[in-house]
Structure formats: structure tokens, C-alpha cells
């Protein structure tokens, strides 16, 4: 926390991750102050001259905003009085990664806190039975990842087994030349078993499960952000 002036207020931030091309939120909260006109919120980014965003006297003031954030930022204006200084960030870019400072001034005092913002790409995998293959196989696809992730397969029946010899993973660059499509095929699968395709980089971990029986195919997928 940075302390200046006679009083300091508690400002809290949370490390978070942004998905390239999507919208993100940089979270920041502070001790509420019912006097909206007396609240100043400034977001700054390490290594960038100018501001990321400024909100004061009940409205935005972007006269000092750095051009890389032009048209991409907003606070949740109706939530400022209850202590929410979080920043909405439109169309997250790889270059948005870095250390941000949320600086607050209210009638009660001043305070600030830093947060680390990671950027990359992550998406849910989808597993399907590949009927075109010569033997029963599973195809795990996830449309957008960056940096390049690792892909691993697991099975409920063969716990601890290494499937690297019976799987093939490829990475195809997407049209924007940053993110990549992940495709992994697992060969020689057996019926009545649950298989998992796990995709992970330093930002996120995603898992897709598929259970194949004689009568049905059940799928489930989940995604979790790491270190946030």
C-alpha cells in the first residue's frame, strides 16, 4: 500500500488474467465513500507514461490517458460509491500484461495497491469421437490458446498411464497470428472408459472429459485460471 497525506485508506486488488481479444476486468476495491464527487480513481501501468484511466467528480476524465488504452476502458460508475474501482478493459491485448496501480483518493484519505495482470489466450476443449480413424480415437480441440500449452491425456481405467506414444498433438496458428488452435488425437481408445484431455499454460488449465459407452457419449469441460 502507498500512504500519503494524513490518512490512508485500504485499497485491495486481485491478480487476474485477461483473454486476448475478449474483455477483462482489473479488480480493485476501497473503503466506500458516499461523496461521489470527492472520489478520484486513477489506474496506472508500470512503464507507461500517462494514465490508463481516470474517474473523478463523478465522471471519466481521459485527458491524460495513454493512447494504447483509448476507447478500451471504463469503471463501473454506478458501483464507485460502494467502493468498487475495478476497471473494465475491452479487447485485451498481449501488451496489456504488466503491473498496474489502482490509486484512490476520497474524503477519508488516499491509498493505492498494485496488481499483476497476465494476458494470454485460453478456451474450453471439446472432445469428440473420431469415427473417421481406422481405430476408435478421440479428438480434443480448443480454438484459442497462447502461449503454447502442454496437452496431456488421462484415463479413469488406466490411471497413471502415459498416453504420449498413442496421441498426436498439433498447434495451428489462428488468423490473427497470435493465438493457436490446439488439436490432440488419442488413438486406440476403449469403450466404457472416461478419458480426459488436459490443456495447460502458465495462465490457465482446461480439462475436457468424455465417457464413451455402448449406449451414449457424455462430455464435460472446465477451465480454471492459474495464480489468480
Amino acid at each position: 500500500f502507498g500512504i500519503s497525506g494524513k490518512h490512508f485508506i485500504t485499497v485491495t486488488t486481485f491478480t487476474s488474467a485477461g483473454n486476448i481479444g475478449e474483455d477483462g476486468t482489473l479488480s480493485c476495491t476501497f473503503e466506500p465513500d458516499i461523496k461521489l464527487n470527492g472520489i478520484v480513481i486513477q489506474w496506472l501501468k508500470e512503464g507507461i507514461k500517462g494514465l490508463v484511466h481516470e474517474f473523478k467528480e463523478g465522471k471519466d476524465d481521459l485527458s491524460q490517458q495513454h493512447e494504447m488504452f483509448r476507447g478500451r476502458t471504463a469503471v463501473f460508475a454506478d458501483q464507485v460509491v460502494v467502493g468498487n474501482a475495478s476497471l473494465r478493459l475491452k479487447n485485451v491485448q498481449l501488451t496489456d500484461a504488466g503491473t498496474y496501480t489502482c490509486y484512490i483518493r476520497t474524503s477519508k484519505g488516499k491509498g493505492n495497491a498494485n496488481l499483476e495482470y497476465k494476458t494470454g489466450a485460453f478456451s474450453m476443449p471439446e472432445i469428440n469421437v473420431d469415427y473417421n480413424a481406422s481405430s476408435e480415437s478421440l479428438r480434443c480441440e480448443a480454438p484459442r490458446w497462447f502461449p503454447q500449452p502442454t496437452v496431456a491425456w488421462a484415463s479413469q481405467v488406466d490411471q497413471g498411464a502415459n498416453f504420449s506414444e498413442v496421441s498426436n498433438t498439433s498447434f495451428e496458428l489462428n488468423s490473427e497470428n497470435v493465438t493457436m488452435k490446439v488439436v490432440s488425437v488419442l488413438y486406440n481408445v476403449t469403450i466404457n472408459n472416461t478419458y480426459s484431455c488436459m490443456i495447460e499454460n502458465d495462465i490457465a488449465k482446461a480439462t475436457g472429459d468424455i465417457k464413451v459407452t455402448d449406449s451414449e457419449v457424455k462430455r464435460r469441460s472446465q477451465l480454471q485460471l492459474l495464480n489468480s
Epitope: 465522471k59 471519466d60 476524465d61 485527458s63 491524460q64 476507447g71 476502458t73 488468423s175 490473427e176
Partner: antibody
């Protein structure tokens, strides 16, 4: 409520500079929550975003027109302006000024009536 | 630049009809899409923002949906005053770009 009105010559000669002004009434363009844009529409055609300006004077121009466009703002007169240099017949269009609905939304919730500018000798 | 492709370019319909216009972005734009209505000799009017949010004062027969690359504007029951040209616009990435327009004509 805020209204926008474009003004400027309706006829410009080729190679000269097109100059338009947008005057706001019923509200202030110094409100920090908005960007102010210029958009044009060629006769019978679609819409083209030219660029925007903030009350502080910072600008962003469409790269396709960037070399020829200059925008400025005069908060004391509650006006913002567009200059487009080295015009050709292809710049003949209805020119609109508009307000972006917030600092992040980039949709246009308020428009001027538009002014037809013809480029001809 | 992000290309916005509207279809159809024109549609003939009658009062009371349900009309659907689609807009496709050349790359993902999340939900940053607006729809406008323009009548001859007039400025465009904002109908829908953020893909599905109805602009204040716009009748509820207008609705928008979609995210990513594919979006739809629906007029649930066409009224005489709805005959106009409709444009989509992406608000995701500079430079902001518009679709080519869809003219809704009287059948």
C-alpha cells in the same frame, strides 16, 4: 438535451481542403464521458468512420484517411472540427458528426443531421 | 480492419412480418456490436448496442442477439415506420467499421 449540427461549405474544389465544424447545443462537449466522431456516407452507399476526438484534443484517425485528416476541438465554443486535405471526387459524401455513447462503448447514440459536401471543379 | 458483412442486402416484407437481418464479423468482436436504422435523408439512429441492449426509446419489437462473429437483428412484427435501411457496426477494434446495410422494403 444535447444536439449536434454540422456546418461548412457544401462545395469544395479538387485538391483543396474540406473543412467542417460540429457545434453542440444543450450540453457540453467537455463532458469527459464521451468521444466525438466524424462519420461519412458516400451517395447511396454505406457508412465510414473517419475518426474521433476527446475534449482534451487527443485524436484517433481511421488509418485509411490518416494522412489527410486533422481534427480539433474548441471547448470555449463547444465545437469540434474536421479538415480533410487534398480532396478528390471520391470524398463527395454526407458528413456526420456524432457522439460515442461512452468511453468504452464506441456506438453512436447522438448524430448531427449531416451535411452534403460535393467535390467538384 | 474488421470486415462486417450483412445479409441479405435487401428484403421485401409486409406489415406484421417477422424480419431477421444477420451480420458477420471477419474476426471475433465479443459482444461489441451496434445496430442502426436509417431513413432516406436522415442520420442513422441507434437501435441496439452491446449486441442485445435496446437503446432508450426504441420499441421492444426490435431485438438483437449474437456474440463472437455472428449477430442478428430481429423485428418481431414489422410496422410501417420500420421500412428503412439497417446497418451493423463493430465497436471492438479501431477503426470502427459498418456493414454494407440491409434495405427493408414494402412487399
Amino acid at each position: 438535451q444535447l444536439q449536434l449540427q454540422e456546418s461548412g461549405p457544401g462545395l469544395v474544389k479538387p485538391s483543396e481542403t474540406l473543412s467542417l465544424t460540429c457545434t453542440a447545443s444543450g450540453g457540453s462537449i467537455s463532458h469527459g464521458g464521451y468521444y466525438w466522431s466524424w462519420i461519412r456516407q458516400h451517395p447511396g452507399k454505406g457508412l465510414e468512420w473517419i475518426g474521433n476526438i476527446y475534449y482534451s484534443g487527443s485524436t484517433y484517425y481511421n488509418p485509411s484517411l490518416k494522412s489527410r485528416v486533422t481534427m480539433s476541438v474548441d471547448t470555449s465554443k463547444n465545437q469540434f472540427s474536421l479538415k480533410l486535405s487534398s480532396v478528390t471526387a471520391a470524398d463527395t459524401a454526407v458528413y456526420y458528426c456524432a457522439r460515442e455513447s461512452s468511453t468504452i462503448s464506441a456506438d453512436f447514440d447522438l448524430w448531427g443531421r449531416g451535411t452534403l459536401v460535393t467535390v467538384s471543379s | 480492419d474488421i470486415q462486417m458483412t450483412q445479409s441479405p442486402s435487401s428484403v421485401s416484407a409486409s406489415v406484421g412480418d417477422r424480419v431477421t437481418i444477420t451480420c458477420r464479423a471477419s474476426q471475433g468482436i465479443s459482444r461489441w456490436l451496434a445496430w442502426y436504422q436509417q431513413k432516406p435523408g436522415k442520420a442513422p439512429k441507434l437501435l441496439i448496442y452491446a449486441a442485445s441492449s435496446l437503446q432508450s426509446g426504441v420499441p421492444s419489437r426490435f431485438s438483437g442477439s449474437g456474440s463472437g462473429t455472428d449477430f442478428t437483428l430481429t423485428i418481431s412484427s414489422l410496422q410501417p415506420e420500420d421500412f428503412a435501411t439497417y446497418y451493423c457496426q463493430q465497436a471492438h477494434t479501431f477503426p470502427y467499421t459498418f456493414g454494407g446495410g440491409t434495405k427493408v422494403e414494402i412487399k
